[in-house]
Interface confidence: low
């Protein structure tokens, strides 16, 4: 293999074929990033998952999926060392694969998941290139504790993470539906309080919004600066 | 249905370098990955190296100093490679296709050649 | 890597009897394992993938069973053919690697 292909972090092609695989190539050891593209307004309102194919007529069995609350799909969801996050209004869901290893090469599906029903939304085979430097960065190693295996890979589960310095949260179309919500919640909000004060009203008796923006009681939303991952 | 043959010469100098092909027939080389696996004489097997037909490679580390896999998808073949070859690695080789993914079992298999390493 | 322990090393057991073969990882693998057949001057022929199921052509008296780190192959009845050396193999780190081998003799 020629010296330059090692070099090569991402390469991305289509394979001939039925198949319609595409191929993300990343270098051992390194981030490899496989970006997913769907019809927005066909898969609305559904959830996603990345699931690593067990067999030719295997299960496609769940890595790890986005949010459970739809319109917080942006928020990054970890499942040892891969993230999931959905651009939902831009129509790209994207996976990280985070200190890449050869035993992560295989074939995945990108899924849109509706009920019980999932949609394949792209077959993507993984292709980890030898480390032309062949050594490990230290601190590639995100989180040291996480078995390497996909032992369990089916129950989801998510690893709390702040956000690093200069890393973008979410995509953009996201972040303006989430400050628009944010934006009417608090509107509504002075506007009873308003109205309760103009009525002679105690504030605590307004009756409640019927804006959810998909916002449950178990999950506190934090404003940026504290913002973490669900 | 898909068989492998693997072809070769039997006998090897200590130092040189062992070189073997797997000729694929009754299928295409351009799908699925594609293995290296050896047995020395009356024990286990041992895992080579793979490679799938772009010339993605991975290799056993504790041979990967030595072990070349390349791939002519025009032959529909692909070739072992061997160096600085001493009598410990005597062995039955076998070349074989990954069932599946390319971290998977392995089927079909060659039928096996044995090489020799002697002076 | 991953280190298979195979047990017993050898099966002394007559045609019709039931054969009962181990595997252990040396950490969990999940079901990423296989079980294979070796008959003398033969390669090794695929039986169960994935833990359990049955490779094409493989007689319904081949079962594979286990999760984690203990895996069972099960020969229901033995036949004459069936007396082989038998490997298992897990796939899911890195490299791929194999355990060390039953054999199954004729008592």
């Known amino acids: 293999m020629e010296p330059l292909r090692l070099l090569i972090l991402l390469f991305v092609t289509e394979l001939s074929g039925a198949h319609n695989t595409t191929v993300f190539q990343g270098v051992a050891g390194q981030s490899l990033q496989v970006s997913c593209p769907y019809d927005s307004m066909k898969h609305w309102g559904r959830r996603k998952a990345w699931c690593r194919q067990l067999g030719e007529k295997g299960p496609c069995q769940r890595v790890v999926s986005t949010h459970n609350l739809w319109l917080l799909s942006f928020l990054r969801r970890w499942n040892g060392s891969t993230a999931i996050t959905d651009d939902t209004l831009g129509g790209t869901l994207t996976i990280t694969l985070r200190n890449l290893q050869p035993h992560d090469a295989g074939l995945y599906q990108c899924q849109s998941l509706h009920g019980s029903e999932a949609d394949t939304l792209r077959k993507v085979l993984v292709e980890v290139l030898a480390d032309p430097l062949d050594h490990r960065d230290a601190g590639d190693l995100w989180f040291p504790g996480e078995s390497e295996s996909f032992e369990d890979a089916h129950v989801e589960h998510s690893i709390s993470r702040s956000l690093l310095e200069g890393e973008i949260p979410f995509p953009p179309t996201s972040i303006l539906l989430l400050l628009a919500c944010i934006f009417l919640i608090k509107i509504l909000a002075a506007s009873a309080l308003w109205a309760a004060a103009w009525h002679g009203q105690k504030p605590g008796t307004h009756p409640p919004s019927e804006l959810d923006c998909g916002h449950d009681p178990g999950y506190q939303l934090q404003t940026l600066p504290g913002l973490r991952d669900t | 249905q898909v068989q492998l043959q693997e072809s070769g010469p039997g006998l090897v100098k200590p130092s040189e370098t062992l070189s073997l092909t797997c000729t694929v027939s009754?299928?295409?080389?351009?799908?699925?990955?594609w293995s290296w696996i050896r047995q020395p004489p009356g024990k286990g097997l041992e895992w080579i190296g793979s490679i799938y037909y772009s010339g993605s490679t991975n290799y056993n580390p504790s041979l990967k100093s030595r072990v070349t896999i390349s791939v002519d998808t025009s032959k529909n073949q692909f070739s072992l490679k061997l160096s600085s070859v001493t009598a410990a690695d005597t062995a039955v080789y076998y070349c074989a296709r990954h069932g599946w993914d390319r971290v998977g079992w392995f089927d079909p298999w060659g039928q096996g050649t044995l090489v020799t390493v002697s002076s | 890597e991953i280190v298979l322990t195979q047990s017993p090393a050898t099966l002394s057991l007559s045609p019709g009897e039931r054969a009962t073969l181990s595997c252990r990882a040396s950490?969990?693998?999940?079901?990423?394992l296989a079980w294979y057949q070796q008959k003398p001057g033969q390669a090794p022929r695929l039986l169960i993938y994935?833990?359990?199921n049955r490779a094409t052509g493989i007689p319904a008296r081949f079962s594979g069973s286990g999760s984690g780190t203990d895996f069972t192959l099960t020969i229901s009845s033995l036949e004459p053919e069936d007396f082989a050396v038998y490997y298992c193999?897990?796939?899911?780190?890195?490299?791929?690697?194999f355990g060390g081998g039953t054999k199954v003799e004729i008592k």
């Open positions: 193999q897990q796939y899911i780190f890195w490299p791929p690697t």
């Open positions: 009754g299928g295409s080389i351009s799908s699925y990955y």
């Open positions: 950490q969990s693998v999940s079901r990423y």
């Open positions: 994935d833990a359990s």
